[in-house]
């Protein structure tokens, strides 16, 4: 017997190691807390609903609750959805939480609360009240939080959730919270560091406020503090994609030289966008454990050339000095202080947005002896000239990022071109910067309603490429020609990203010759001309090749395309050639004895496989080891009969999604003896096979979502014992008969998706209603989205909660 009702519109999971029962009711359009929540629930999530109030009855009998996530049930109007505005704030009745003696974490963000709730249990360790309307913090409102360790009060007064008054914090308001470890007051228009703070703090977030001056004793007693974030106070507003007010006269955040003296345990200091012009070494006199320092978005271009403060940072692992360029200045080259050489522990150095013309070998000499350096990020700098051979000094680096520059092979270092280029270059990068929105996001650590963990999204290189080893990222530059001398001395590279350049040459197999160790090449978003079947053949160790979005020459008629270049790449495992509009090929077949995955989305197999033209039906046949083939988005409204005979013998996964297929030759699946996954989603299919097991004995996963299927055949799943996953969601299915869904097959399913269909809940549905009520098969969204379209009385009702008792009487009669 089940231990919770199927009518519960929530996902219930067990975390056995932690002994947790997790009930997740996220975004279920709830207007009240649902009945049937198991009494032994430990973690209850009710975020993104429209529950108007909480009372002592809300959690009655849920005595084991350890965490309640009740965020975003009444999001402040400027922050919330405009088509579903919440005009009555969440009401929390007295003693709603006081009986929950095990409650440790309570999230009440995004509910328009005016006050810190009272009557909280003493067990509480985490309280999150972000994105509410609380802008006055008084000592008396915090008296019950004696055991609180984590307190989030941010986003209660800022441009997206304005409060129109000044944020006030009573003196010593937090002082009695003697166990407080994490305090966040971010995005609140706070004008001064609150005093006195409890000495137990390990993390203090004061970013995006209106603090103009740090006082000498603000942090005096915080000798356990490990993270301090003061970013966005006195912000650098140039190019900010959000309302931004600098301090008076564009002055920097004022920080006394001894402000950090007590912070002997500090590991992370973030001073992003504080309009700093200098970094006094004295700040770091006592902070010798600092591991991460963010100084991005300041005015430190000159300081980078002096940077004596770096001598005091022997433990520093990450340093970010990005976007510190002087306005309207295009420097000839980069001036790095010799002090960088003292950063013996440094692993990650980011200097984007310094804005300079030529990267010279000696510019990087202070970094040569940094044995631990792994990531050097010089992206978005408008570098025009760079001799890549200089990176032979940096073989130990995992990532050299030169993306979003203007590097081109024609660079002539004699042409300095300061004045003529400076203005246009600096201005021209504004839209590119907005694209990335890491350095230019208002709050890069903001949480959405859906996830309660901070989402520090750091754009980095393509992860799948990075894992192969040393990576050089030259994406989004102005390279229009590559030659082997460009890569001289770079034989150590494992991954090269050339995506988003202007390369239009006919590659002949010589261009990348020095790159003997290269495993991954991203050549997407260029203008590849596949005239020669020898293209890329010099890359003897290449395992992954991405030539997606190179449609330029494929869109023109009469051009030679040698798609059989694959035969010369002896260890190629994965080839991506998506969105190329390929509609012709000079070679009739692609060949490879190593390729396992081919992505061929967004091409024109409808043209290559035109009715009556059999020349290309064997296009993929000689990819002898191919296991995955994605030919979705190829405008295939039908498949010619020879297509499956021409498929490679070891194919396991085949995707034909988004093709507009109106019919499918199910019987032809017999040709694919090893097929395990077939994705036919987002087509216009109206039928399923008579008997799936007659078409395939190997198929484990069948995805038919978003089609036009109205009914299932009588013996659809008869004997389909190997099937584990079946997705029939978003179709027009009205009825499911018992014979279509035999129990001995369904019981093997791990997942069955039936939501968003058009079930008719007449007496003919009695078996189906009975079955969904009793089956152990996981059916996502069963309580909420497996619903009836009729008849009248049952319209919109959940199938699971149907009462067809009268039909059962008819049956027994």
């Amino acid at each position: 017997a089940r231990w919770f009702p199927k009518t519960l519109p929530c996902d219930v999971t067990l975390d056995v190691p932690k002994n947790h029962v997790i009930v997740d009711c996220t975004d279920k359009h709830l207007t009240e807390i649902p009945g049937g929540i198991p009494t032994n629930t430990t973690n209850l999530t009710l975020t993104i609903n429209h529950i108007p109030d909480i009372s002592p009855a809300s959690f009655h009998r849920l005595d084991h609750l350890v965490e309640i996530d009740f965020r975003c049930n009444c999001v402040p109007i400027p922050l919330g959805s405009k088509n579903n505005m919440c005009i009555k704030r969440l009401q929390i009745k007295p003693r709603s939480f006081s009986g929950l003696t095990y409650l440790k974490s309570l999230y009440l963000d995004g509910n328009q609360l005016l006050e810190i709730p009272q009557g909280l249990p003493p067990s509480l360790q985490l309280l999150s009240l972000e994105a509410n309307n609380i802008f006055s913090i008084r000592k008396e409102n915090l008296t019950e939080l004696a055991n609180i360790e984590i307190l989030y009060l941010g986003q209660n007064c800022y441009y997206r959730n304005p409060c129109y008054v000044s944020y006030s914090i009573e003196k010593d308001a937090f002082l009695n919270l003697t166990k407080l470890k994490v305090l966040s007051l971010k995005d609140n228009n706070v004008t001064a560091v609150p005093t006195v703070l409890p000495s137990t703090l390990t993390e203090l977030y004061l970013y995006n406020n209106m603090i103009a001056k740090i006082q000498e004793d603000d942090f005096n007693n915080l000798n356990q503090l490990q993270i301090l974030d003061l970013s966005g106070n006195c912000p650098r507003c140039y190019n900010a994609p959000f309302p931004c007010a600098p301090c008076k006269n564009n002055s920097p955040l004022q920080i006394p030289v001894n402000a950090f003296d007590a912070l002997t345990e500090l590991k992370v200091l973030r001073l992003h966008s504080n309009s700093l012009q200098h970094v006094p070494p004295r700040w770091f006199k006592n902070i010798n454990k600092l591991q991460e320092l963010d100084l991005s978005q300041n005015f430190l271009a000159k300081e980078i050339g002096d940077a004596k403060f770096l001598h005091f940072l022997p433990s520093l692992i990450q340093l970010d000095l990005s976007f510190n360029f002087e306005l309207q200045v295009y420097r000839a080259s980069m001036n790095l202080s010799q002090a960088f050489s003292s950063l013996k522990s440094l692993k990650i150095l980011r200097i984007r947005g310094y804005v300079f013309k030529e990267l010279k070998s000696f510019n990087l000499s202070p970094l040569h002896n940094l044995q631990n350096l792994e990531v050097l990020d010089l992206g978005t700098n408008f570098i025009k000239i760079a001799n890549l051979s200089m990176f032979k000094q940096f073989k130990r680096l995992k990532v050299i990022d030169l993306s979003v520059n203007k590097i081109s092979p024609s660079g002539d270092s004699s042409e300095v071109g300061f004045c003529s280029n400076a203005r246009t270059s600096v201005e021209s990068y504004e839209p590119q910067v907005l694209e990335q929105l890491h350095y230019f996001r208002y709050d890069k650590y903001a949480r959405s309603c859906r996830f309660k963990n901070k989402e520090a999204s750091f754009m980095s290189v393509n992860e799948s490429c990075y894992k192969y080893g040393q990576t050089l990222d030259l994406s989004k530059n102005s390279i229009f020609f590559v030659k082997s001398s460009d890569f001289q001395h770079l034989s150590f590279l494992k991954c090269l990203n050339l995506s988003g350049n202007l390369i239009s040459q006919t590659l002949n197999g010589s261009e990348f010759q020095p790159l003997a160790e290269l495993r991954y090449l991203d050549f997407s978003n260029n203008r590849l001309d596949l005239l020669h079947s020898t293209a890329f053949e010099e890359l003897h160790k290449l395992e992954v090749l991405d030539i997606s979005s190179n449609s330029h020459y494929f869109q023109s008629e009469g051009i030679t395309h040698m798609l059989n270049f694959t035969k010369n790449l002896k260890v190629l495992q994965k080839l991506m050639m998506n969105d190329n509009d390929i509609s012709s090929s000079t070679s009739r077949t692609m060949e490879s004895e190593s390729l396992r995955t081919l992505e061929f989305r967004g091409n024109h197999l409808d043209v290559l496989w035109r009715e009556g033209d059999n020349r290309y039906l064997q296009l993929f046949k000689n990819l002898l080891k191919l296991e995955e083939l994605d030919i979705s988005k190829n405008s295939l409204s039908f498949l010619p009969s020879g297509v499956f005979d021409g498929m490679p013998p070891n194919l396991k996964n085949l995707s034909l999604a988004k093709n507009g297929l109106k019919s499918f030759s199910w019987k032809k699946l017999q040709c694919l003896k090893n097929l395990e996954t077939l994705d036919l989603s987002h087509n216009q299919l109206t039928t399923v096979p008579e008997r799936l097991s007659n078409c395939s004995r190997s198929l484990k996963n069948l995805i038919l979502k978003n089609n036009q299927i109205r009914s299932l055949t009588k013996y659809f799943l008869q004997d389909a014992f190997q099937l584990r996953y079946l997705d029939l969601s978003s179709n027009k299915i009205q009825m499911i008969q018992k014979t279509s869904f035999p129990e001995n097959v369904l019981n093997n399913l791990k997942m069955l998706l039936l939501h968003h269909n058009r079930f008719l809940c007449t007496c003919d549905a009695v078996w189906f209603v009975w079955w969904v009520n009793h089956t152990e098969v996981t059916i996502p969204y069963l309580a909420t989205d497996v619903t009836c379209v009729g008849p009248g009385a049952h319209k919109g009702q959940s199938v699971i909660s149907l009462d067809l008792y009268t039909c059962e009487l008819d049956l027994t009669n």
Epitope: K213, P256, N258, K308, H311
Partner: antibody
């Protein structure tokens, strides 16, 4: 511009308490800065005595700590030095000076008074 | 205490001369070294802070250098108004001063 002016008795008896006042004009002593006392005995090096910060926090030279008190009167924009149990060795020119907390480095005294001579003698 | 030793204690020079004064600390002071100018009856003036940074309004003929324990003040071309006493001061711990160097007219 910031200006500092020392004042106080030029003669103090041994074992008495030396009291000096520094009047600051052109800047509020509660806005910024650490306000220092420094002395120079005849033919000798300058010696830092101590300071009071714009927040009222004090810091003293360890060798004089037991005898020194620095205080302030914010209404008059003044800060004062008291040095108890004086001896002839405390005879010196006494200077007040400011140090910008929000500058680049510790104890770079950017504004000085002209100094006042104090003789300890009976 | 950190002891500061200045040399020479005095020197004679002419207008236009290049003058160098050195200061040695009893231990590494991490560049926390300042230089001052003192004239009789006048307020002391800050010239250079943090080894080499020129205080606002100070002429560029004054420069500072050094690291660790050894530091130097250089006047590239001595002017009449530069005849005065110069002293160094460390700010790594509580401040201590050098004994001063008197620059006199030759």
């Amino acid at each position: 511009d910031v200006q500092l002016q020392e004042s106080g008795p030029g003669l103090v008896k041994p074992s008495d308490t030396l009291s000096l006042t520094c009047t600051v004009t052109g800047y509020s002593i509660t806005s910024d800065y650490a306000w220092n006392w420094i002395r120079q005995p005849p033919g000798n090096k300058l010696e830092w005595i101590g300071h009071i910060s714009y927040r009222g926090n004090t810091n003293y030279n360890p060798s004089l700590k037991s005898r020194v008190t620095i205080s302030r009167d914010t209404s008059k924009n003044q800060f004062s030095l008291k040095l108890s149990s004086v001896t002839a060795a405390d005879t010196a020119v006494y200077y007040c000076a400011s140090w910008n907390y929000y500058g680049y480095v510790d104890y770079a005294m950017d504004y000085w008074g002209q100094g006042t001579t104090v003789t300890v003698s009976s | 205490d950190i002891q500061m030793t200045q040399s020479p204690s005095s020197l004679s020079a002419s207008v236009g001369d290049r003058v160098t004064i050195t200061c040695r600390a009893s231990q590494d002071i991490s560049n926390y070294l300042n230089w001052y100018q003192q004239k009789p009856g006048k307020a002391v003036k800050l010239l250079i802070y943090y080894t080499s940074r020129l205080h606002s309004g100070v002429p560029s003929r004054f420069s500072g250098s050094g690291s660790g324990t050894d530091y130097t003040l250089t006047i590239s071309s001595l002017q009449p108004e530069d005849f005065a006493t110069y002293f160094c001061q460390q700010g790594d711990t509580f401040p201590t001063f050098g004994q001063g160097t008197k620059v006199e007219i030759k």
